[in-house]
Amino acid sequence: EEELQVIQPDKSVLVAAGETATLRCTVTSLIPVGPIQWFRGAGPGRELIYNQKEGHFPRVTTVSDSTKRNNMDFSIRIGNITPADAGTYYCVKFRKGSPDDVEFKSGAGTELSVRAKPS
């Protein structure tokens, strides 16, 4: 079995303010079991954007239904984009752990740029 890879196919995405951003992410394996999280930025100060396992993320919807069997698509949509949302977004696979899940592998990142609404 080949080791799981996290694929973020878009290096950059440009979205107009007020629109919805789609950030694409797929994984290449069902192994290891564990959730996906999305972050803006890297390192200890990164901001959690979406956690498949738990939390409330009212601006985020998933593109695919993650409960469906063998799902490997963990793309998300972020609604009502503002300039403050600009940054690099990372799709990160976690491995089931006890008591806490453990970070396993990150995608290469997608840079979100926001185009101002024409006045």
Epitope: V33, K53, E54, D65, S66, K68, R69, K96
Partner: antibody, heavy 119, light 110 residues
């Protein structure tokens, strides 16, 4: 961490119905399947059915299709299994279990609810 | 429905020795490169505990003396060096289609 807390033991007469509850915490209830499994005294494990709380999609073991009904209450993160037309051979411990990988497996289990059917 | 048959029904092994439990499916449980077999351990008075998923992957926190192997229809759970705390009933389960369990194998110390 993930916890599944089941309702207490029940004693029922033949022909009656029972409804067992399973309250989930430590994760987003709508993101993972819930399975129900039973175990008669001194016997093996028998899969009953499963439910996706996000859309109430269900799959049943044919043996239980006419007598069991799975439901969920997403407002309280609780899953329910109702079994009707009880017989003495339905006496068993009934478990709920959460599928963390959408593999139709059982990663986290409740402690079980003993249902005794006796006249 | 796919039927899983475990062998043996019961097994007695000396401490420190290897224990092997087999699970045979009535038809292949493989799909898209994965083997949809899971192994559980159940101790008296407790719910089952997942040990192995997709035939050969150790679940979180499971000691590495446990291993799983096999493909298609024939699968094996191996405990490389039996410890006293491994006394339990072991079940295989498939999810190639709707889940079913094997009948269980009771593991005791010789």
């Amino acid at each position: 961490q993930v916890q599944l807390v089941q309702s207490g033991a029940e004693v029922k007469k033949p022909g009656a119905s029972v409804k067992v509850s399973c309250k989930a915490s430590g994760y987003t209830f709508t993101n993972y399947w819930i399975n129900w499994v039973r175990q008669a005294p001194g016997q093996g494990l028998e899969w009953i059915a499963m439910i996706d709380p996000s859309d109430s999609e269900t799959h049943y073991n044919q043996i239980f299709k006419d007598r069991a009904t799975l439901t969920t209450d997403t407002s309280t993160s609780t899953a329910y299994m109702e079994l009707r037309s009880l017989r003495s051979d339905d006496t068993a411990v009934y478990y709920c279990a959460m599928d963390y990988g959408s593999l139709y497996a059982m990663d986290y289990w409740g402690r079980g609810t003993l249902v005794t059917v006796s006249s | 429905d796919i039927v899983l048959t475990q062998s043996p029904d019961s097994l007695a092994v000396s401490l420190g020795e290897r224990a092997t439990i087999n699970c045979r499916a009535s038809k292949s449980v493989s799909s898209s490169g994965y083997n949809y077999i899971f192994w559980y351990q159940q101790k008296p008075g407790q719910p089952p505990k997942l040990l192995i998923y997709l035939a050969s992957n150790l679940d979180s926190g499971v000691p590495d003396r446990f291993s799983g192997s096999g493909s298609g229809t024939d699968f094996t759970l191996t405990i490389s060096s039996l410890q006293a705390e491994d006394v339990a009933v072991y079940y295989c389960q498939h999810s190639r289609d709707l889940p079913t369990f094997g009948q269980g194998t009771k593991l005791e110390i010789k």
